[in-house]
């Protein structure tokens, strides 16, 4: 959420989060790498355009006009410089001057060699155990952020992977309206609106960058799970990959998988919603997963078909009014999975991305918890690959991504909650190979896809 250097009484009171890069003459002498021309400390630009009326509680949620409830000054980096103190490069660039292009390749998990699969699983496990070197998370809302004594910032360290989980939780949590009042749940800053794809794109990009730094491996890339198999089995749920089913409890992961040892965060929803606290770094129970096991909902017992992807890529408008989960002929709502693969909205339908989550039938199917199951990463890289193919085919036509009146958090220029430094949806609405430094090694099914005899 915020850099550790900004989780201080001084920074929070001043509203300035502009850390030094290389302060040779003492603190505050090289904010944003200003001495080397990398950036400068400037007023935050936050979207103030109106959102749709379905959120009626303006002024009650820290995520409104993000991140102004916490900070109003941040680093503005020049050229290809980037990061909380302009100390790194924009995605896709490297070198001391951030002037050299770089391209990493995201590949199908099943196509990786045995060594590569092992490396990926080990890397995820390392990310689960490694404290995030940069970010800390708030455990209280802004009005309580300095603690009961007004002098103790309420932040915690968190692991790299749990930070990935926490950011997702924070984007979907209910709006707390006060003790004794029911929290408002018709709000979601990362789903059911145009920002769904851009938000999850940055979410993955941040994890990938954090893991590259953790491993000191610039080529490290997140693989994808092609979930559009039409099958009723999880082909990546093997012990060498994401973990098979436990023989002792069909809703748990096999003890032969490292993921059986993982414990979830952000599971105490009742506390958050009634006490107004936030998810902290405390780990709870194990990951639950029971692929194809929801017998009460037969429609989520089978994964999407390959032709569902081909069909959704023919929906040419990125989004359509009301820019919500009931939009028709919206590519975003189709790939998100609230419309059928042809783009037609149907309240009974769960397809593509949503269907893949629900198919997992456990932790991965609960929005506030879903990233706790590392399959989330692979499911979303595939979703992002579909998004990138759409951007390629339709020349990244942003014209139907609304500037205003989208659900709160979903306007085109909104800073995606709770990422830092502030990053807008627009910045992620670009073809990845040319603009973000990664590409997918993938073959797309044609519309006439048919299974060979």
């Amino acid at each position: 959420q915020f850099p550790r250097q900004c989780a201080t009484v001084e920074a929070l009171r001043s509203g300035m989060c502009c850390p030094d890069l290389s302060p040779v003459s003492g603190p505050g002498t090289d904010r944003c790498g200003s001495s080397s021309g990398r950036g400068r400390c400037e007023a935050v630009t936050a979207d103030s355009r109106p959102h749709s009326p379905q959120y009626p509680h303006d002024g009650r949620d820290d995520r409104e006009v993000w991140p102004l409830r916490f900070f109003n000054r941040t680093c503005h980096c020049n050229g290809n410089f980037s990061g909380h103190n302009c100390g790194t490069c924009r995605p896709g660039w490297r070198g001391a001057a951030c002037d050299q292009r770089v391209l990493i390749v995201r590949r199908n998990l099943l196509d990786l060699s045995k060594e590569e699969k092992n490396h990926f699983v080990r890397a995820l496990d390392m990310a689960k155990r490694t404290t995030h070197p940069l970010f800390v998370i708030a455990t209280r809302r802004s009005e309580e952020i300095l603690g009961p004594d007004g002098n103790t910032p309420q932040f915690e360290n968190i692991s790299i992977y749990n930070y990935f989980v926490w950011t997702h939780y924070y984007s979907v949590k209910k709006t707390f309206l006060g003790v004794g009042q029911e929290s408002f749940g018709e709000v979601d800053f990362s789903h059911e609106g145009p920002a769904f794809l851009t938000w999850h794109r940055y979410h993955l990009l941040r994890l990938e960058k954090d893991m590259q730094e953790m491993l000191q491996e610039p080529s490290f890339s997140l693989p994808y799970w092609n979930f559009a198999t039409g099958k009723n089995v999880c082909d990546i749920c093997t012990d060498d990959l994401m973990g098979s089913r436990s023989n002792f409890d069909s809703t748990l992961i096999s003890p032969n998988s490292v993921f059986s040892q993982w414990r979830v965060v952000c599971d105490s929803l009742e506390d958050y919603d009634t006490l107004g606290t936030l998810c902290n770094s405390t780990e709870d129970g194990p990951i639950r997963r029971n692929p194809a096991g929801n017998v009460a909902r037969p429609m989520v017992q089978r994964l999407p078909e390959p032709q569902d992807v081909a069909q959704c890529l023919e929906v040419g408008l990125f989004d359509t009014p009301p820019f919500y989960s009931n939009s028709t002929n919206s590519f975003r709502n189709t790939v998100e999975g609230y419309s059928d693969p042809t783009g037609k909205y149907d309240p009974a339908v769960r397809s593509l991305h949503n269907l893949a989550h629900l198919f997992l039938n456990g932790t991965g199917g609960q929005t506030h918890l879903s990233p706790n199951d590392p399959i989330f990463v692979l499911l979303h890289t595939f979703t992002d690959a579909v998004f990138d193919e759409w951007l390629r085919r339709y020349n990244a036509d942003i014209s139907t991504f609304p500037l205003e009146n989208a659900p709160i958090g979903h306007n085109r220029q909104y800073n995606m909650v709770p990422f830092w430094p502030p990053v807008t949806n627009t910045e992620m609405f670009v073809t990845a190979p040319d603009n973000l430094g990664y590409t997918y090694e993938i073959q797309w099914p044609s519309r006439e896809f048919s299974v060979p005899e």
Partner: antibody, heavy 121, light 107 residues
Framework: EVQLQQSGAELVRPGALVKLSCKTS????????LHWVRQRPDQGLEWIGW????????VYDPKFQGTASLTADTSSNTVYLQLSGLTSEDTAVYFC??????????????WGQGTTVTVSS | DIQMSQSPASLSASVGETVTITCRAS??????LAWYQQKQGKSPHLLVY???TLADGVPSRFSGSGSGTQYSLKISSLQTEDSGNYYC?????????FGSGTKLEIK
């Protein structure tokens, strides 16, 4: 002045294990990744792996996975390489070296003097 | 894994001459490359990082160049103290392998 001071030469029996040390000075080891490199007699350099002393994370070349083990003691600014199941093929000079935490800089910039390990019965 | 093919394996040149050592990576390593010099019985010594940036204290007669999969180290105006072994190493993907080395002899 940056220094990496390695422990003395070792003569060990096949099948045994040995623990080499690398004591650093002139920098905070929590700000660097410490790498180890092997050089067999009259051969080239082989990368073994790294340790992040700040959190104990380690990564190894798959060919050293299971036989090499890296640890760190930040209180004494020392990193260790333990080698197990030694064979004559492990007779070599072992170097410790450092890399800036900023992974963008592609280099091992300071090296220890090396420790000679001889495996012989 | 990225393999580093270094050539030549050895070369001999006279004082004042210019020599070039090359390293070819089996895939694009995007300038994540370092060059080291190692004298007999001594530790390796960093010469160049990020493919073309000279390390502190390294004489300007050393220079690194290249991109993609092809990289080279040029030593101009050879001096007698330049004899030794030279190695490249990539830092693009794990494991961070070295080239096989080049033995430089000064005639």
């Amino acid at each position: 002045e940056v220094q990496l001071q390695q422990s003395g030469a070792e003569l060990v029996r096949p099948g045994a294990l040995v623990k080499l040390s690398c004591k650093t000075s002139g920098f905070n080891i929590k700000d660097y990744f410490l790498h180890w490199v092997r050089q067999r007699p009259d051969q080239g350099l082989e990368w073994i792996g790294w340790i992040n002393p700040d959190n104990g994370n380690t990564v190894y070349d798959p060919k050293f996975q299971g036989t090499a083990s890296l640890t760190a003691d930040t209180s004494s600014n020392t990193v260790y390489l333990q080698l197990s199941g030694l064979t004559s093929e492990d007779t070599a000079v072992y170097f410790c070296t450092r890399r800036d935490y900023t992974y963008e800089k592609a280099a091992l910039d300071y090296w220890g003097q090396g420790t000679t390990v001889t495996v012989s019965s | 894994d990225i393999q580093m093919s270094q050539s030549p394996a050895s070369l001999s040149a006279s004082v004042g001459e210019t020599v070039t050592i090359t390293c070819r990576a089996s895939g694009n390593i995007y300038n994540y490359l370092a060059w080291y010099q190692q004298k007999q019985g001594k530790s390796p010594h960093l010469l160049v990082y990020d493919a073309k940036t000279l390390a502190d204290g390294v004489p300007s007669r050393f220079s690194g160049s290249g991109s993609g999969t092809q990289y080279s180290l040029k030593i101009s105006s050879l001096q007698t103290e330049d004899s030794g072994n030279y190695y490249c190493q990539h830092f693009w993907s794990l494991p961070f392998t070295f080239g096989s080395g080049t033995k430089l002899e000064i005639k």
